[in-house]
């Protein structure tokens, strides 16, 4: 789903307050709800009728450093006989997410939010038919 | 997918540098790749064999303020005849994502990362059979 544009108003102080110096803000250390965990049914990527593989991307200057991307294995979906049915389609489910980018020059470290598009998994759909003139 | 624990090392300066004052860091205003957009096939939540609905949660002190959660419509999956087949299961696909929490006391505004569990959509799976003693 979409993350709206900041318009940067979210990060501004109330109008009656002095502006943020040097275009930066104070980010407190620590993460709220850090222990919260995904509780998905096991191995759904293999058990799905629209199965997918995972690819891990790693960047030490990003938090989280590891971002996992899904790729649908087939164009079609897997039927009850375990065969690919291409009258149906496996399609990716995408999500916009935030990561934190670390930038450093010597001992001066700053951070910036970055929007990343993550393919989370796949689902089986009836394709939309377009009549081409 | 899982976001690892920070261990707070990501946000620390190199060991040879003076520590971060007051447990906070500098977050630059603006978002990298802000214009990046989801490009999913249209209405997949209705066209899927494991369809879902969306619920929007809104919080003005969170960025993004709008977080969309999916809920699978059925226990089973929709077959070619448009009927629910309960030999298969619709299961949620979850993703851990980061949001920014805004905290203010008067003109003092600070921000903190928060982990949120988002259900992005649903997929149709073969249920795992557990033999209960």
């Amino acid at each position: 789903r979409k993350i709206p544009k900041v318009g940067h108003t979210f990060f501004q102080k109330p109008e009656s307050c002095p502006p943020v110096p040097g275009g930066s803000m104070k980010l407190d250390i620590g993460i709220i709800n850090e222990n919260q965990r995904v509780s998905m049914s096991r191995n759904i990527e293999s058990r799905s009728t629209s199965p997918w593989n995972y690819t891990v991307t790693w960047d030490p200057n990003r938090y989280p450093s590891e971002v996992v991307q899904a790729q649908c294995r087939n164009l079609g979906c897997i039927n009850a006989q375990g065969k690919e049915d291409i009258s149906m389609n496996s399609v990716p489910i995408q999500q916009e997410t935030l990561v934190v980018r670390r930038k450093h020059q010597g001992c001066s470290v700053s951070f910036q939010l970055e929007k990343v598009l993550v393919t989370v998994g796949c689902t089986c759909v009836t394709p939309v038919i377009h009549h081409v003139q | 997918r899982k976001i690892p624990k920070v261990g707070h090392t990501f946000f620390q300066k190199p060991e040879s540098c003076p520590p971060v004052p007051g447990g906070s860091m500098k977050l630059d205003i603006g978002i990298i790749n802000e214009n990046q957009r989801v490009s999913m096939s249209r209405n997949i939540e209705s066209r899927s064999t494991s369809p879902w609905n969306y619920t929007v949660t809104w919080d003005p002190n969170r960025y993004p303020s709008e977080v969309v959660q999916a809920q699978c419509r059925n226990l089973g999956c929709i077959n070619a005849q448009g009927k629910e087949d309960i030999s298969m299961n619709s299961v949620p696909i979850q993703q851990e994502t980061l949001v920014v929490r805004r905290k203010h006391q008067g003109c003092s505004v600070s921000f903190q990362l928060e982990k949120v569990l988002v259900t992005v959509g649903c997929t149709c799976v073969t249920p795992v059979i557990h033999h209960v003693q």
């Epitope: 164009l75 399609v91 759909v125 394709p127 939309v128 377009h130 | 096939s41 249209r42 997949i44 066209r47």
Partner: nanobody, 116 residues
């Protein structure tokens, strides 16, 4: 924008052969397929044959297996449907299709008539 150009339909006697061709232009992803559906007025559209654009995997309806062969020339994104030992029940409008995940683009169709 996807464009499809079909050719090769016509009238043929039972047991005869025809070759349909179709070329596709526009945005083509690696996870896509090209093929043919057919439709008899008043009946449901039927998938006849499909070929995966990168893997080259082929799929056939049970009713045409062993008689129809789908092939593809990668260089110009053209597919062919070689139809042998045609039967009266093969009479239909044949639509060239290009399938991107979630979207099926369908041409204007070409009539195939098999007379007994």
């Amino acid at each position: 924008q996807v464009q499809l150009v079909e050719s090769g339909g016509g009238l043929v006697r039972t047991g005869g052969s025809l070759r349909l061709s179709c070329s596709v232009s526009g945005d083509i992803s690696s996870q896509s397929a090209m093929g043919w559906y057919r439709q008899v007025p008043g009946r449901q559209r039927e998938l006849v044959a499909m070929i995966h654009t990168t893997k080259g995997d082929t799929y056939y309806a049970d009713s045409v297996k062993g008689r129809f062969t789908i092939s593809r020339i990668n260089a110009n994104n053209t597919i062919y449907l070689q139809m042998n030992n045609l039967k009266p029940e093969d009479t239909a409008i044949y639509y060239c299709t290009h399938n991107e995940p979630g979207d099926l683009y369908m041409g204007q169709g070409t009539q195939v008539t098999v007379s007994s």
